[in-house]
Interface confidence: low
């Protein structure tokens, strides 16, 4: 038996930050679980981890240098990624493992979310072109 995961097909990070919500066909309340976000078609880079246990504070961390935070809902985990670079535009996959209580469960691979990072272009506004040269 596998947990199903739903993700937005695409998100655009205009300000180098994005909220990616992973919605599960499973209620995480009173469960010990490890939710993670992976980058790339081969999910080679573990971007962020949310480790949950109903009797402990949520643990959120990244071992790969991403600036991330996480929030827990009954059937969802939302990853908040900040300071993304344009070259981190890629497909991102949600993963979930439920350790306790048994049986151990994980998810069917989701379709993923393409995160398109649009860099901040610090161009002068055409309405305020700045001082003109004499």
């Amino acid at each position: 038996n596998k947990i199903l995961v739903k993700q937005s097909p695409m998100l655009v990070a205009y300000d180098n930050a994005v909220n990616l919500s992973c919605k599960y066909s499973y209620n995480l309340f009173s469960r010990e679980f490890r939710a993670s976000l992976h980058k790339g078609l081969d999910s080679a880079v573990e971007v962020c981890v949310v480790y949950g246990n109903y009797s402990q504070q949520l643990q959120v961390y990244s071992k790969t240098g991403f600036n991330c935070d996480g929030k827990l809902g009954n059937e969802s985990v939302t990853f908040y990624l900040q300071n993304l670079y344009v070259n981190q535009t890629d497909i991102y996959f949600c993963k979930i493992e439920v350790m306790y209580p048994p049986p151990y469960l994980d998810n069917e691979k989701s379709n993923g979310t393409i995160i398109h990072v649009k860099g901040k272009h610090l161009c002068p506004s055409p309405l305020f072109p700045g001082p003109s040269k004499p």
Epitope: E32, N53, Y54, M99, Y100, P101, P102, P103, Y104
Partner: nanobody
Framework: EVQLLESGGGLVQPGGSLRLSCAAS????????MAWVRQAPGKGLEWVSN????????YYADSVKGRFTISRDNSKNTLYLQMNSLRAEDTAVYYC???????????WGQGTLVTVSS
């Protein structure tokens, strides 16, 4: 280097009690589920009990449910198994194990022998 060192085994009469301990080192104890597994003489391994990282979630094999209690003290990096109402069929070497995922264990101790006999 991960090390798990069991203690507390011994000879006990049927109906008696024992408390096993497992001192863990070489990893962040509080980040991992732990388990007890046993092996009776001439038999295969039998899973006994699991405990979650915080100690609040526990699970037991039917053969020990209601008689054994698993617990942990994360401040002491120690896992425990309180065994009450012991029976002859509980005679086994008891191993402490670090949980990788549910009933998959990546590190084991050397074991402690529990003998239940009159």
């Amino acid at each position: 280097e991960v090390q798990l060192l069991e203690s507390g085994g011994g000879l006990v009469q049927p109906g008696g009690s024992l408390r096993l301990s497992c001192a863990a080192s070489g990893f962040t104890f509080e980040n991992y589920g732990m388990a007890w597994v046993r092996q009776a003489p001439g038999k295969g391994l039998e899973w006994v009990s699991n405990i979650g990282r915080a100690g609040s979630v526990t699970y037991y094999a039917d053969s020990v449910k209601g008689r054994f209690t698993i617990s942990r003290d994360n401040s002491k990096n120690t896992l425990y198994l309180q065994m009450n109402s012991l029976r002859a069929e509980d005679t086994a070497v008891y191993y402490c194990a670090k949980v990788q995922s549910w009933r998959t264990f990546d590190y084991w101790g050397q074991g402690t022998l529990v003998t239940v006999s009159s």
